[in-house]
Interface confidence: low
């Protein structure tokens, strides 16, 4: 691109009188300094539009010469008002002013869009002294312009607490369109309308937008930026992008994929984390979500026993974590388990079914028909019971636990006995005479200790007093007499 300098106002000669505009004179600069200014005043001017016939802020000096003639007003000379150039090109512009020598310590600062330019900018101030006045030229150069260099530049000079401001110099950096908003990837419902937005800026303006779907242009005529494309609906995945055109050329946005939401894939890798007598902890790996977030999952459980009625238990849970504890299961039972998850479109198919088993549990029923009597001749207490119903043991019986508590005149002590699974009777030694013995029995499996039977009490008299009457708990629904040995 060609660097173009365009003047919006006819410039005055750079220097009146002894300072020709070319600077190619015998006056060599007395001093040449890079710009460095310590003060940073607030913005104190309103930029004027190029072409306005004045010379910025003017300071009227109050000092008079020996002949008492007032000094001319101080003002920056007019210079180029508007520079248009392409990105990465170099540019140099300046402002100049003639200052009577009676003024000392004059400094010129550069400002852009109301902010002082400090530090690493290429600003040079040159001083050309003469008998009565010093010509000051402040130059500003940018070696490779960026879009961020766009703006209004002015010079400021401080003299005797007066501030003199130059006319603005407008720098316009032109380049390829620059995207401020690009289309974004979306997941959409099949055959449902959606919008895509594309916005790009110059300069130069205008910027025109073409939409592209799967490498083909969507619109025959370009639309001015910003552009919103309304897609009436898709039945399959598509890739969209937009082209932004201006006088400098074309920029293409990133291509974005528009996915069609679908039901999820079934979960995979359903696995058993832990089993107890009445619960199974499972985990699973979700399948592909169908471009729509998972909401819920359903765990389906059916008894694997061929004789079962085939009914399915369903447990619903949230999608996260991918973990669920299935409860209220029977002990020592086999189950088939499958998992399905849903998104806003619908439910996935069920995962491959896996087989899982619950472990033995503690018995759920106490031994029945507990009978206790005193065998005084051997100073023993005999205990008898009936095995609890096998189906309710929740596992293989490994034995019984007997609790016997002896209470007499403020003394109370509990003893525990273990009995093998084949027994249905036990004999314990009398611990205390003239006392009450309370007996309870519980069945034991590998899964734990079941509930204790209701307590049965028997009084153990002092030596010499005989009572052969047994104490017992009746077996439910069983009126048969209990054999007493």
């Amino acid at each position: 691109a060609i660097t173009e300098a365009r003047e919006e106002a006819k410039p005055y000669p750079l220097f009146p009188g002894p300072f020709p505009g070319s600077l190619q004179t015998d006056h060599t600069p007395l001093l040449s300094l890079p710009h460095a200014s310590g003060y940073q005043p607030a913005l104190m001017f309103s930029p004027t539009q190029p072409g306005r016939p004045h010379t910025g802020n003017v300071a009227i000096p109050q000092v008079t010469s020996v002949e008492s003639k007032p000094l001319p007003p101080l003002a920056f000379k007019h210079t180029v008002g508007h520079i248009i150039l392409s990105e990465h090109k170099g540019v140099k512009f300046n402002c100049s002013i003639s200052v009577p020598n009676i003024y000392q310590d004059t400094t010129i600062s550069w400002w852009k869009d109301g902010k002082e330019l400090l530090g690493a900018h290429h600003a040079i101030t040159q001083f050309y002294p003469d008998d009565e006045v010093t010509a000051i030229i402040a130059s500003f150069s940018i070696t490779s312009v960026q879009r961020s260099d766009n703006g209004s530049y002015i010079c400021k000079m401080k003299i005797n607490n007066e501030e003199i401001v130059s006319d603005p110099i407008y720098i316009e950096v032109q380049g390829l369109p620059h995207f401020t908003k690009q289309p974004e990837s979306m997941n959409v419902t099949r055959n449902t309308a959606f919008n895509l937005t594309c916005q790009a800026v110059g300069p130069p303006e205008p910027v025109n937008i073409f939409w592209v779907q799967n490498s083909s242009r969507v619109n025959e005529q370009p639309e001015k930026s910003p552009s919103v494309l309304t897609v009436p609906g898709l039945t399959e995945m598509a890739v969209f992008s937009c082209e932004a055109h201006n006088d400098k050329g074309l920029t293409v946005s990133k291509g974005v994929q528009i996915n069609i939401k679908a039901i999820p894939s079934p979960p995979t890798e359903v696995s058993i984390r832990n089993s107890t007598a009445h619960s199974i902890l499972i985990s699973w790996v979700p399948g592909f979500d169908g471009y729509s977030p998972f909401r819920n999952c359903s765990i389906q459980v059916k008894e694997a026993d061929p004789l079962s009625n085939g009914s399915v238990m369903i447990f619903n849970t949230s999608a996260l974590p991918h973990l669920y504890q299935i409860k209220q299961l029977q002990a020592l039972a086999n189950y088939s388990i499958g998992v399905s998850c849903m998104n806003e479109i619908g439910w996935s198919a069920v995962s491959p079914w896996i087989l899982a088993s619950t472990t033995e549990g503690a018995p759920s029923v106490a031994p029945l028909n507990v009978t206790v009597f005193l065998n005084e001749s051997s100073d023993n207490v005999d205990i008898r019971w009936m095995k609890p119903p096998t189906k309710q043991q929740d596992g293989e019986l490994v034995g019984y636990r007997i609790s016997h508590v002896w209470q007499s005149a403020g003394i109370s002590k509990e003893l525990l006995e273990e009995v093998g699974q084949n027994g249905s009777r036990a004999r314990i030694s009398v611990q205390v005479h003239n006392a009450t013995c309370t007996v309870r029995i519980a069945a034991v499996t590998r899964g734990g200790v079941g509930p204790f039977s209701d307590p049965v009490k028997i009084f153990i008299p002092a030596h010499g007093w005989v009572d052969y009457a047994p104490s017992s708990t009746p077996a439910p629904g069983n009126a048969d007499p209990v054999l007493i040995i």
Partner: antibody, heavy 120, light 108 residues
Framework: QVQLVQSGAEVKKPGASVKVSCKAS????????INWVRQAPGQGLEWMGW????????KYNEKFKGRVTMTTDTSTSTAYMELRSLRSDDTAVYYC?????????????WGQGTTVTVSS | EIVLTQSPDFQSVTPKEKVTITCSAS???????FHWYQQKPDQSPKLLIY???NLASGVPSRFSGSGSGTDYTLTINSLEAEDAATYYC?????????FGQGTKLEIK
């Protein structure tokens, strides 16, 4: 572009409640969860829970259950988090975040944070 | 609750060095559920790496992630001054979602 803009700082007394807002823009609000994550001064990040704007489905960290309520207003694409019975250890910066599902839950966009100070 | 433990808690490094931050989980996590964040002072956290090794948008290629099972690593090759921040790991495997305690990286 996706943006989450949160309400300003709050100073509350112990026992009071605070309600923080989070306005979403640049994406379809109802498609993603809004999560709330807090960070006590000089501490790490702590997840409080999420809400799915499409149907109001919430999931809370057990630690905050009973004290926190998350809601949304889909007409304004705004999420709210209310924390009740405030204690001094609730002093923190509260962030709203967009939860990216992909079944793998991470937070791809964050709000600028709202400082809540609980002091008597 | 899955507990994530980062190591070290603090590290002071010179520019151009290679930095490794590790994160150990209390139970096995699929690599798909493991993510890293960067938080610079007085800023919100920013997604850095998702699914163990995928760089989030705009993240420089000097960052990388790896790991499986219970042990995950964030690596910064040729550290730059702008990398001074606190780094957090996060798991998306189970609720409650949890973060590591953070690793503060200081540039010497």
């Amino acid at each position: 572009q996706v943006q989450l803009v949160q309400s300003g700082a709050e100073v509350k007394k112990p026992g009071a409640s605070v309600k923080v807002s989070c306005k979403a823009s640049g994406y379809t609000f109802t498609t993603y969860d809004i999560n709330w994550v807090r960070q006590a001064p000089g501490q790490g990040l702590e997840w409080m829970g999420w809400i799915y704007p499409r149907d109001g489905y919430t999931k809370y960290n057990e630690k905050f259950k009973g004290r926190v309520t998350m809601t949304t207003d889909t007409s304004t694409s705004t999420a709210y988090m209310e924390l009740r019975s405030l204690r001094s250890d609730d002093t923190a910066v509260y962030y709203c975040t967009r939860g990216y599902y992909d079944n793998l839950y991470y937070f791809d966009y964050w709000g600028q944070g709202t400082t809540v100070t609980v002091s008597s | 609750e899955i507990v994530l433990t980062q190591s070290p808690d603090f590290q002071s490094v010179t520019p151009k060095e290679k930095v490794t931050i590790t994160c150990s989980a209390s139970s096995i996590i699929s690599s798909n559920y493991f993510h890293w964040y960067q938080q610079k002072p007085d800023q919100s956290p920013k997604l850095l790496i998702y699914r163990t090794s995928n760089l989030a948008s705009g993240v420089p290629s000097r960052f990388s992630g790896s790991g499986s099972g219970t042990d995950y690593t964030l690596t910064i090759n040729s550290l730059e001054a702008e990398d001074a921040a606190t780094y957090y790991c996060q798991q998306g495997r189970s609720v409650p979602l949890t973060f590591g305690q953070g690793t503060k990286l200081e540039i010497k």
